[in-house]
């Protein structure tokens, strides 16, 4: 929270590679590489939907929706097991995210 | 979307008191959410925050003085036992890794004898 | 324990530029967040990340940071910008997380 950015300066992350394809099932599933300089005490995760440094903390507990995932205006929760997250839009369409 | 605080009041020292913030137009499950005060005449002091999984910090002055806690629309600060230096206006604010872009109008806590 | 620090007062005449400071050993790696508060009323958020606006905040409004030193800058002062002037950042991280406020900078325009 509130670290700065810059040229990948410590607690930063930028992206290098974002792919969209689509599966048989029409279903499409966005890849998305980051590259993390992340301090002590942090560790790469997602912050508004983008890649971003969070407290190592929030990964180890699977507190998922610490990391403020979801965009402004949707709702986040956890999935069975802790196994990722869904952010829900105020229109009702929920985007699911797992993490393996 | 707004915040608004409540429970504020003329308390003696040493009687807990709680405050209650309430959210409407938004979910509290993608925001932080924070305490600050304002004693009469001074600074904005910041108390403590809530993650959406209910985990908290604190100011290292407000440890032990102060306990943060969360329901699905609220969130509440109590004040364990009250010393006449908390006499203060009450803000909660919303949080991300913005800043604190919301805030509530404020509630009065007096604290004498 | 982290220390924001700000002048108590600053003057400035009806619609010249004022700049004021806020300084810190951490705000070379962290953001520094930039609040209005007018008597009576609750803090608005300004500047957050040294530099961004929210939207409605006037562009009269714009904030830097350089090394140790974040700076929040006026143009064309307005009678309605006499205010107390709050940066604000925060440190650490896991059990160690705090945010914290300068002292404030009550500005006054003549």
């Known amino acids: 929270q509130f670290l700065k950015e810059g040229q990948l300066a410590a607690g930063t992350c930028e992206i290098v590679t974002l792919d969209r394809c689509c599966n048989k099932n029409r279903r499409t599933i966005a890849r998305q590489t980051a590259r993390c300089a992340c301090r002590k005490g942090q560790i790469a995760g997602t912050t508004r939907a983008r890649p971003a440094c969070v407290d190592a903390r929030i990964i180890k507990t699977k507190q998922w929706c610490d990391m403020l995932p979801c965009l402004e205006g949707e709702g986040c929760d956890l999935l069975i097991n802790r196994s990722g997250w869904t952010c829900t839009q105020p229109g009702g369409r929920i985007k699911t995210t797992t993490v393996s | 979307q707004s915040l608004e605080e409540s429970g504020g009041r003329l308390v003696t020292p040493g009687t807990p008191l709680t405050l209650t913030c309430t959210a409407s137009g938004f979910s509290l499950s993608t925001y932080y959410m924070s305490w600050v005060r304002q004693a009469p005449g001074k600074g904005l002091e910041w108390i403590g925050i809530v993650y959406p999984s209910g985990t908290t910090y604190y100011a290292n002055w407000a440890k032990g003085r102060f306990t943060i806690s969360t329901a699905s629309t609220t969130v509440d600060l109590m004040i364990t036992s009250p010393t006449t230096e908390d006499t203060a206006t009450y803000f909660c604010?919303?949080?991300?890794?913005f800043g604190y872009g919301l805030w509530g109008p404020g509630t009065l806590v007096t604290v004498s004898s | 324990e982290l220390v924001l620090t700000q002048s108590p007062s600053v003057q400035v005449n009806l619609g010249q530029t004022v700049s004021l400071t806020c300084t810190a050993d951490t705000l070379s790696r962290s953001y520094a967040s930039w609040y209005q508060q007018k008597p009576g009323q609750a803090p608005v958020l300004l500047i957050y990340r040294d530099t961004s606006r929210p939207s409605g905040v006037p562009d009269r409004f714009s904030g830097s940071s350089s090394g140790n030193t974040a700076t929040l800058t006026i143009s064309g002062a307005q009678a309605g910008d006499e205010a107390d002037y709050y940066c604000?950042?925060?440190?650490?991280?896991?059990?160690?997380?705090?945010?914290?406020f300068g002292g404030g900078t009550q500005l006054t325009v003549t």
């Open positions: 604010a919303r949080g991300d890794s």
């Open positions: 604000a950042t925060s440190d650490g991280s896991g059990s160690n997380y705090q945010y914290v």
